[in-house]
């Protein structure tokens, strides 16, 4: 049994202001048990991106649909990207706890920088 | 085609033990957590226990008395359960797993199940 | 630990005829509830999972509904093969699973 892989392909996404930013994430397992999340930065003062399970995140949706049977490409899509987006993106395979899921497995993160504005 | 193949029920008095097994096939089980189900006679369906890979899962109604495992190498799920109590008894149903909306499962193979009965 | 209230515990259809029944979530659960099929001396059958996907190989006469902690199972047309114990389980919030205490449909 392979132990899980949290891919993420991109190293650097250059995104414009007011596009949607596509940020990639894949998982090589199933297991363990327990959602992914997205969040910004590390550490205690990172900030929560996307939870399927709680939360309202206005400008975020899935690449994947949420009814999909076994996913495992936990991809989001920000809209309306602003200056204040950029940073870099974790997503974050957690293992089901009881009651508190306990973080098990980070991807490399995606860093998400202005590019130059298309003339 | 899944299938779930439970063995190990009987009868057994009142703080004895039993290990049932469920043999899987037709998928590929390590990559799927999996679960007991048990239903008293006349009653309903009560979740007992889920295992993914190293990660186990209990009711509070068996913690400390149940023990889940798998051996991925055999296919093989396992409920080893001891002190059993009269309120044990019931049909134990081994199930696979599937998950949807990024965390949370639902049980889409069930077995034909086997039937525990804890008296003295 | 999410309690499921289903109702009525028994409903008594005649062949053919619509049956309706809920299931009432004592908190939200979103979308993550499936429903299941037990026959007379089988084991649970999963038909519908997410509230209203139907599983695989599932006629088209079972249909879900409802979102947070309202949900509605529905059969078209009973057949004879439709007379059994349905259960609901959420999946939103565990452990522990839970499910409902189940809906008896009989023949009227």
């Known amino acids: 049994e392979e132990e899980l892989q949290m891919i993420q392909p991109e190293k650097l996404l250059l995104v414009t202001v007011g596009k949607t930013a596509t940020l990639h994430c894949t998982v090589t397992s199933l297991l363990p048990v327990g959602p992914v999340l997205w969040f910004r930065g590390v550490g205690p003062g990172r900030e929560l991106i996307y939870n399927q399970k709680e939360g309202h995140f206005p400008r975020v949706t899935t690449v994947s649909d949420l009814t999909k049977r076994n996913n495992m490409d936990f991809s989001i899509r920000i809209s309306s990207i602003t200056p204040a987006d950029v940073g870099t993106y974790y997503c974050v395979k957690f293992r089901k706890g009881s009651p508190e899921n306990v973080e098990f497995k980070s991807g490399p993160g995606t860093e998400m920088a202005l590019g130059a504005k298309p003339s | 085609e899944v299938q779930l193949l439970e063995s190990g029920g009987g009868v057994v008095q009142p703080g004895g033990s039993l290990r049932l097994s469920c043999a899987a096939s037709?998928?590929?089980?390590?990559?799927?957590?999996m679960t007991w189900v048990r239903q008293a006679p006349g009653e309903g369906l009560e979740w007992v226990s889920t295992?993914?890979?190293?990660?186990?899962y209990y009711a509070d109604s068996v913690k400390g008395r149940f023990t889940i495992s798998r051996d991925n190498s055999k296919n093989t799920l396992y409920l080893q359960m001891n002190s059993l109590r009269a309120e044990d008894t019931a049909v134990y149903y081994c199930?696979?797993?599937?998950?949807?909306?990024?965390?949370?499962?639902?049980?889409?193979?069930w077995g034909l199940g086997t039937l525990v009965t804890v008296s003295s | 630990e999410i309690v499921l209230t289903q109702s009525p515990a028994t409903l008594s259809v005649s062949p053919g005829e619509r049956a309706t029944f809920s299931c009432r979530a004592s908190?939200?659960?979103?979308?993550?509830l499936a429903w299941y099929q037990q026959r007379p001396g089988q084991a649970p059958r999963l038909l519908i999972y997410?509230?209203?996907i139907r599983e695989t190989g599932i006629p088209e006469r079972f249909s879900g509904s409802g979102s947070g902690t309202e949900f509605t199972l529905t059969i078209t047309s009973l057949q004879s093969e439709d007379f059994a114990v349905y259960y609901c389980?959420?999946?939103?919030?565990?452990?522990?699973?839970?499910f409902g205490g189940g809906t008896k449909v009989e023949i009227k």
């Open positions: 199930a696979k797993d599937s998950t949807v909306s990024w965390s949370g499962d639902f049980f889409d193979y």
């Open positions: 037709g998928f590929s089980f390590s990559n799927f957590a």
């Open positions: 295992i993914g890979s190293g990660d186990t």
């Open positions: 908190q939200n659960v979103k979308n993550d």
């Open positions: 997410a509230a209203r």
């Open positions: 389980q959420q999946y939103y919030d565990w452990p522990p699973f839970t």
